[in-house]
């Protein structure tokens, strides 16, 4: 996911939308104006606000890399919402990139779990029932490594 | 507790320039998102312009663009805005603020209105 416009000096003109802030403060698909008076609405499918908020700038809007599905468009109020296509997830610790889901399980592993936008295939020794952890290659028919991707520990 | 001390203001012709300074101490300074904000004689505050801590992300109101710059120096803890081609409506207190509750969103810093920690101010008078 990336910013749409990482150079936030080129300020938009102000929109034609205006409004008092209440104590201070102005709704959701709006910011506040330069003097604090008034309540200025963001422009649909650039940014958005989501909260009562004394923003100077709404925040801008982000675009769904290639590799992702747009599940729904910002709007004023409410910042896209982007998805990785199938066949790929994003983990938690690395949400900057969708990766590829694998493909099966290495031998004396099944599959528990299938590929999601948000995990892998979650596989687990037949006999014991442990998760794998880590990243397999091998499939289960296939389960020799390619060079310099060794098959990783289960724990 | 931060403080701040701006300094540099003065009386400037029209189409002179100036440069704001604001020290700060009792912080971490390069962890504090900033901003100038001003107030001319009988009216309210008006934010001015904005810099993240890491100075890559900068603010301006659109009646300084193109006129003003911030920028900061976190090895001197010291903030400045540079001013040029002064206007009579330029004239007013410049404060220099620093935002506690800071917005960031994608990585990006968004200033509030409502920055918290606030200089005593520096007088800019611009007259023939």
């Known amino acids: 996911i990336t910013q749409q416009d990482l150079a936030p000096q080129q300020r938009a003109a102000p929109q034609q939308k205006r409004s008092s802030p209440s104590e201070g403060l102005c709704p959701p698909g709006h910011h506040i104006s330069e003097d604090g008076r008034d309540c200025i609405s963001c422009k649909y499918g650039q940014d958005y606000s989501t909260h009562w908020n004394d923003l100077l700038f709404c925040l801008r809007c982000t675009r769904c890399d290639s590799g992702e599905v747009e599940l729904s468009p910002c709007t004023t109020t409410r910042n896209t919402v982007c998805q990785c296509e199938e066949g790929t997830f994003r983990e938690e610790d690395s949400p900057e990139m969708c990766r590829k889901c694998r493909t099966g399980c290495p031998r004396g592993m099944v599959k528990v779990g299938d590929c999601t936008p948000w995990s892998d295939i979650e596989c687990v020794h037949k006999e014991s029932g442990t998760k794998h952890s880590g990243e397999v290659p091998a499939v289960e028919e296939t389960v020799t490594s390619s060079p310099g991707t060794p098959a990783s520990p289960c724990s | 507790e931060v403080q701040l001390l701006e300094s540099g203001g003065g009386e400037v012709q029209p189409g002179g320039s100036l440069r704001l300074s604001c020290a700060a101490s009792g912080s971490t300074f390069s962890s504090l998102d900033m901003g100038w904000f001003r107030q001319a004689p009988g009216k309210g505050r008006e934010f001015v312009s904005a810099?993240?801590?890491?100075?890559?992300?900068?603010y301006y109101a659109e009646s300084v663009k193109g006129r003003f710059t911030i920028s900061r120096d976190n090895a001197k803890n010291t903030l400045y805005l540079q001013m040029s081609s002064l206007r009579a409506e330029d004239t007013a207190v410049y404060y220099c603020?620093?935002?506690?509750?800071?917005?960031?969103?994608?990585?990006?810093?968004?200033?509030?209105?409502?920055?918290?920690?606030w200089g005593q101010g520096t007088l800019v008078t611009v007259k023939p």
């Open positions: 603020a620093v935002d506690t509750q800071p917005t960031y969103s994608g990585g990006v810093y968004y200033p509030r209105y409502g920055m918290d920690v």
């Open positions: 810099i993240s801590r890491s100075g890559d992300n900068i």
